[in-house]
């Protein structure tokens, strides 16, 4: 009889085991195991009869197409076999074992104990077959295994072989290497690659296919496993395989279809082509004069395109309009886009304006092209230019006119300070009473006019001051304070102030520039008890234009010393007195005043001590503070208090031999004007050189003009 | 014609305050100075300060500093005076004065319990 | 403060005859810049507001009659009425605006 067993493991013995077993016997046990396993049977009791070849008795192991062993007796022999020690391993996962014994026993023999069970197979080693390994990588676990692929790679609905996912490969440059994938090494089986390529209509693709050329055939059947097909519109090349790469292909299209196909087996290395576009050609390009043509090549087909640009200095001039390069193209009717333009040099055009300043050619007929160049200087003797640069200006090939030091920007020239168009006299001898001064002697001197309408009935005075630059007159605080209150600071409205400037003989303001204020700046510490920190700046409501008659006077270096005593400095003024007039009345009549034309008088500065001894000796709260100095003469005379409130005291630098403003006509004693011992005082400029630059938003000793260096 | 029209009376208890208006004609009202005058029987004129509607620069004696404020409202050319903390002693006649020339009517202000 | 002193504190005079009365300050109202003396006269009458005469010690106010005049200089100033008529019946106040403005006292003028 048969018995059928599933279980993973188990036990067979003899009929009767463990006694005798009976004769004319036969048991046939079926072990069945899942697939993935085989059954391992190994014997810990045998006893058979024994025979030669095992005729009589017997037990046969077997799968269904083979007999795995046939174990008789007590002990191997030469003819007969016991399974002793040994295991008997199923090929699969069937097994079947048989049990027969003959009709006679001469001995009593007591038969088998046998044990199965259930092993795993690993396919992974195993299986050498490739139609049933795994392509890549394989995976053996308990009753069975997977396969799994490389990077890049998926697996096949085989479960089995490895393909890529290859079926969208555009391709659109003009020039391409294409692969099978994974090339130089084998390419993936089961896959289907498609490859496309897709220029612009005009372009022909040419292919070209590269020495190393395998792909699996066979010898009869024209490429039944793997092969390559080009599909050309409705056309198809191919197929193609084999070790013999197929000849350049001009497709005559712009676009192309390559299908690869692999199948599930194979070690083939694959294939690479190159292609390329072909177009139309277009003629030959000369570049133009001062020009030149890139990529320069020695044929150019449809969509080449070339960049035409100039020499440095020469612009592309197309349809009249300047650029730096022009790209032209190849048609696919192998004409080129555009015409070749042509280079034309750069033209910087008419310089700029430069504010008080000119400029001229150094190059012939004025020429304001590449190279040419230009020099821009200052209207002297009234402007100098900042830091001295040169000036010289060439027109660069970007067509802006470059200088070294500024670059594209334009020079600055700034006022020349303390440098009238006339000398000063020497300073040696004293001038009486004060003399005429000739136009242009003191071109800073400003007359200061304040009409304050604010009080009924209008106040009107007059005072001087100093030109130091287009824009601001340096005067005295106490000039531009609201008159009619002693113990108060109200600065002037700048509406009720007019400056005049160039004014020489008051009966004659033909000459003469006036300006209104934009800006009236007293010093925040003025002070109208003691005119300590009188000092006070106006701003003008436009620049005035320097010439011979209008310059300003440059302010001093800051030193808290002030002027040398005894140094000899002058001080102008018309000395006018009368307010009770308009200014038209003023500027054009000179009865009114001390003199009609500018009066100027040479003063010697006074030791400090000697002039605060000399008003702390009178009645009176006098105060000479370090922010003043005296200048006049011991014995008196008219001259010592001629000039008018807030006019400059000026001394010529001896190093920079310019008229530098040391002092503001401030104050002076109760007595008669003149009087012995009552000397002028005059407030400190030096003291307040960084205020006045702070003032009028400059850097302090900017030169020229400015400061004295 | 330049005018300078003043509030009407006024009577107030000590510790209040009173705001005496002054209101310009006839003249631009920015541009000039309006003063502040106050007349006792007996005590002659005392000058209290001045005001410059354009800009708002005032100018006060030291002795009315903190009684007197001033104020303009150039959009309706009135100038006014604020007194605070009344007593007895700041009963008088309050003049507004444009820049010394031109006077006005006079508010005459009595302080009384 | 400058102080004004006016002299006398009244006087009563006939019509038509001549009248001088003095204001005195403590210090010089003439500016240096300016060079204008800053004395003004004004004249009170009664139950009225005070109404300019005289201001930069001299100069006349436009529609005030001639027969008042203003003079002095420095400190000492003089308001003259060269012929009184009935309606000149007032308090005369001097002022200075120099400095901090103060009035002198006043002058009452009464007609016999």
């Known amino acids: 009889h048969t018995v059928e067993l599933n279980d993973m493991f188990g036990q067979i013995q003899s009929p009767g085991y463990p006694d005798s077993y009976p004769s004319d016997s036969e048991v046939t046990w079926n072990i069945t195991v899942p697939d993935g396993f085989r059954i391992k049977l190994y014997f810990m009791h045998f006893n058979l009869e024994s025979s030669y070849l095992c005729e009589y008795d017997y037990v046969k192991v077997e799968t269904e197409d083979q007999v795995l062993a046939t174990f008789c007796g007590r002990e191997t022999t030469d003819t007969e076999q016991t399974p002793g020690q040994e295991v008997v391993l199923s090929p699969g996962s069937f097994m079947s074992i048989t049990f027969r014994s003959d009709f006679s026993n001469e001995e009593r023999f007591t038969g088998f104990d046998a044990h199965y069970m259930a092993v795993d197979v690993d396919e992974c080693k195993e299986r050498e077959d490739e139609e049933l390994s795994c392509d890549h990588y394989c995976h053996n676990y308990i009753g069975g295994y997977y396969c799994s692929c490389r990077f890049g790679y998926i697996l096949h609905t085989d479960n089995r072989t490895c393909r890529v996912e290859c079926s969208d490969n555009l391709f659109t440059q003009r020039t391409g290497v294409i692969t099978s994938p994974d090339f130089p090494n084998p390419y993936p089986k089961s896959s289907e690659c498609l490859y496309t390529i897709e220029l612009e209509e005009g372009f022909m693709v040419n292919l070209q296919f590269e020495d190393i050329f395998d792909i699996e055939d066979h010898p009869e059947v024209p490429c039944p496993y793997d092969y390559i097909k080009i599909k050309v519109g409705p056309k198809v090349l191919g197929p193609f395989c084999g070790e013999k790469a197929p000849e350049p292909i001009n497709t005559q299209s712009h676009s192309v279809l390559i299908l690869f196909h692999s199948d599930n087996s194979g070690e083939n290395r694959g294939w690479r082509l190159s292609y390329r576009a072909a177009g139309n050609e277009c003629p030959e390009l000369q570049p133009p004069v001062h020009g030149k043509i890139e990529p320069s090549q020695a044929k150019y087909s449809f969509k080449d395109q070339v960049l035409i640009s100039c020499d440095t200095g020469y612009k592309v001039l197309k349809d009249n309009v300047e650029m730096d390069t022009f790209q032209i193209e190849c048609l696919k009717d192998g004409t080129w886009s555009n015409k070749i333009p042509t280079c034309k040099i750069v033209d910087c055009r008419a310089p700029g304006e430069l504010e008080h300043g000119l400029v001229t050619f150094s190059t012939r007929n004025n020429l304001t092209t590449y190279k040419s160049e230009i020099r821009y200087s200052c209207q002297e003797p009234y402007y100098k230019m900042l830091n001295n640069i040169t000036g010289i200006y060439t027109c660069s090939a970007q067509g802006v006119w470059m200088n070294k030091v500024l670059g594209r920007s334009l020079p600055t020239c700034l006022p020349e300070c303390g440098q009238p168009s006339r000398s000063l006299p020497s300073l040696v001898k004293r001038i009486i009473g004060g003399r005429n001064a000739e136009p242009g002697l003191f071109p800073w001197q400003a007359l200061i006019v304040v009409e304050d309408t604010s009080r009924v009935p209008n106040d009107k005075w007059f005072g001087s001051g100093a030109l130091l630059s287009e824009s601001w007159i340096l005067t005295a605080a106490h000039v531009l304070r609201s008159q009619r209150r002693d113990t108060t600071v109200i600065p002037v409205s700048k509406e009720h102030v007019t400056v005049y400037l160039g004014l020489h003989d008051v009966r004659d303001k033909s000459g003469a520039v006036n300006s209104s204020a934009a800006r009236v700046v007293l010093h925040p510490d003025f002070n109208i008890q003691n005119y300590n920190h009188d000092i006070a700046l106006v701003q003008l409501q436009e620049p005035v234009p320097l010439g011979p008659h209008v310059m300003p006077v440059c302010l001093p270096r800051l030193e808290p010393e002030g002027p040398s005593p005894h140094m000899l400095g002058l001080v102008a003024g018309w000395g006018i007195s009368n307010p009770n007039v308009t200014v038209d009345e003023i500027i054009s009549s000179g009865t009114r005043t001390l003199s009609d034309v500018l009066q100027y008088v040479k003063l010697p500065v006074v030791p400090h001590a000697e002039c605060k001894t000399s008003y702390e000796s009178r009645s009176g709260n006098y105060s000479v503070t370090e922010n003043m100095f005296c200048a006049g003469y011991y014995e008196g005379g008219k001259d010592t208090c001629l000039g008018d409130s807030g006019g400059a005291f000026v001394i010529l630098d001896d190093l920079s031999q310019r008229w530098v403003v040391q002092g503001l006509v401030s104050w002076g004693g109760p007595e008669e004007c003149g009087s012995k011992q009552v000397y002028g005082v005059y407030t400190k400029v030096s003291n307040y050189v960084d205020w006045v630059w702070e003032q009028m938003g400059s850097p302090q000793g900017r030169a020229p003009g400015g400061t004295v260096s | 014609e330049v005018q300078l029209q003043q509030s009407g009376a006024e009577l107030v208890k000590p510790g209040a305050s009173v705001k005496i208006s002054c209101k310009a004609s006839?003249?631009?009202?920015?541009?000039?100075?309006i003063e502040w005058v106050k007349q006792r029987p007996g005590h002659g004129l005392e000058w209290i300060g001045e005001?410059?509607?354009?800009?708002?620069?005032?100018d006060y004696n030291e002795r009315f500093k903190d009684k007197a404020t001033f104020t303009a409202d150039t959009s309706s050319n009135t100038a006014y005076m604020q007194l605070t903390s009344l007593t007895p002693d700041d009963s008088a006649t309050y003049y507004c004065?444009?820049?010394?020339?031109?006077w006005g009517s006079g508010t005459t202000l009595t302080v009384s319990s | 403060d400058v102080v004004m002193t006016q002299t006398p504190s009244s006087l009563a005079v006939s019509a038509g005859e001549k009248v001088t009365m003095s204001c005195k300050s403590s210090?010089?109202?003439?500016?240096?810049?300016?060079?204008?003396?800053?004395l003004a006269w004004y004249q009170q009458k009664p139950g009225q507001s005070p109404k300019l005469l005289i201001y930069?010690?001299?100069t006349r106010e436009s529609g005030v009659p001639d027969r008042f005049t203003g003079s002095g200089s420095g400190t000492d100033f003089t308001l003259t009425i060269s012929s009184v008529q009935a309606e000149d019946l007032a308090i005369y106040y001097c002022?200075?605006?120099?400095?901090?403005?103060?009035f002198g006292g006043g002058t009452k003028l009464e007609i016999k």
């Open positions: 006839g003249y631009t009202f920015t541009g000039k100075w």
């Open positions: 930069w010690a001299s």
């Open positions: 004065v444009r820049s010394e020339d031109l």
């Open positions: 210090q010089s109202l003439l500016n240096s810049v300016t060079r204008k003396t800053y």
């Open positions: 002022k200075q605006s120099y400095t901090l403005p103060t």
């Open positions: 005001i410059l509607p354009g800009s708002g620069s005032t």
